[in-house]
């Protein structure tokens, strides 16, 4: 009874629910993540426990500082939901659920080029496709390391397409494309494709 009264005596504003968060919300399988469980009351000694569904994953004490739980997300079921419990003597509160989004990384895309050559211009069509990786995938096309297209979002496993027209160039042009999905800081690039200068009949990508 005393324990119940003690917990009731701790007003909600003195001992509110803890907050569970992670700097990384979108992860790939095998990734290590840190989860932070924190509390607004900085002067209490708090015991933090982390749960995934009903599985207890660890316990840490702290005062004024968040508990940091380091995990590895190896299977789909480990995406969550996670919950943190903050406990002070007989009183405990739970955080809201937190779940990770598991995303498969994009594989290196393949860049294909088609060219229609006229006497004065080259009409270039660039196709870029990453055959693996969670959708949507954003594709960006580059010419000589400079982005020449906006990010093109693809929600299906079809190549992104970008058209450009150039005056017949006198120099070689190098093209590549970038594929990126929701995984932060994880982008892959195609092998570069070099378009030779307009000298003679050399136009290996031209439609005859």
């Amino acid at each position: 009874r005393k324990a119940v009264l003690d917990c009731e005596a701790m007003k909600t504003n003195e001992f509110p629910s803890p907050c569970l968060d992670s700097k990384t919300k979108v992860v790939m399988k095998g990734q290590n993540v840190s989860m932070f469980c924190s509390h607004k009351n900085k002067s209490l000694q708090i015991t933090y426990s982390l749960f995934r569904r009903k599985t207890h994953l660890g316990t840490q004490d702290g005062k004024g500082e968040p508990a940091i739980f380091n995990l590895s997300i190896t299977e789909a079921h480990e995406s969550g939901p996670y919950k943190c419990k903050a406990q002070v003597t007989s009183c405990s509160k739970y955080s809201r659920d937190f779940s990770f989004t598991i995303v498969d990384p994009v594989t290196s895309p393949v860049l294909n080029i088609m060219v229609i050559q006229t006497e004065t211009d080259r009409h270039i069509t660039l196709h870029c496709l990453s055959v693996n990786g969670s959708l949507p995938i954003n594709y960006t096309f580059f010419e000589n390391h400079v982005a020449i297209s906006p990010a093109i979002s693809k929600y299906d496993r079809e190549p992104a397409e970008f058209n450009l027209t150039k005056k017949n160039p006198g120099e070689e042009e190098e093209y590549r494309c970038e594929a990126k999905n929701r995984l932060p800081n994880y982008a892959t690039y195609s092998h570069p494709v070099t378009m030779p200068s307009t000298g003679g009949d050399s136009c290996p990508f031209c439609l005859k």
């Epitope: 002067s43 316990t59 004490d61 005062k63 004024g64 500082e65």
Partner: antibody, heavy 119, light 110 residues
Amino acid sequence: ESQLVESGGGLVQPGGSLRLSCAVSGIDLSSYAVGWVRQAPGKGLEWIGIIGRSGSIYYASWAKGRFTISKDNSKNTVYLQMNSLRAEDTAVYYCARDVDSRPPTGSLWGQGTLVTVSS
Amino acid sequence: DVQMTQSPSSLSASVGDRVTITCQASQNTYSNLDWYQQKPGKAPKLLIYQASKLASGVPSRFSGSGSGTDFTLTISSLQPEDFATYYCQSTSWGSSYVGGFGTGTKVTVL
């Protein structure tokens, strides 16, 4: 009345080990954190580490590796295991119950135990 | 580890003087700061805990203030028994932070 009593200090040779005990009475170790602090002769206070009520342990960066804190709730005792001792580890070692705000309680210290590292 | 910068490192004062000691933490320690008094050969004695709470049995001439990183211990009217060394201590601790002591302030007779 709550009190903490340190024991286990004494003379030890460089490279040796020592285990200090902190017997706690009038305090439930499962409700409070207990830390270790030391003071070399003529020097200031130096924080070593702390063990929380559920048993998680945090150390000052200089103490990691050579110093280990543990506790036995059934004996109401906290321990400080010290390995590879050096002359500069000569100090009075104190254990202390940490401050908490519910109920509002200040820290409570033992009287200390002297550790002398010398050949 | 948190670094606690205490100043001054020493001061001379007379009985009846108002004495102020400051402590600055390298990281936010909220209100988790204690002040101790220590006399030679004795264990530290708690004066103030959680930045401003007076410990049991401590005279009201001692007071503490501050939060976050900047803290102050004030002795409103220095008494003969107050000549000692004073330490601040950050008492925040956890996964990413551990406490620490200031370097001390020795208060001597002018």
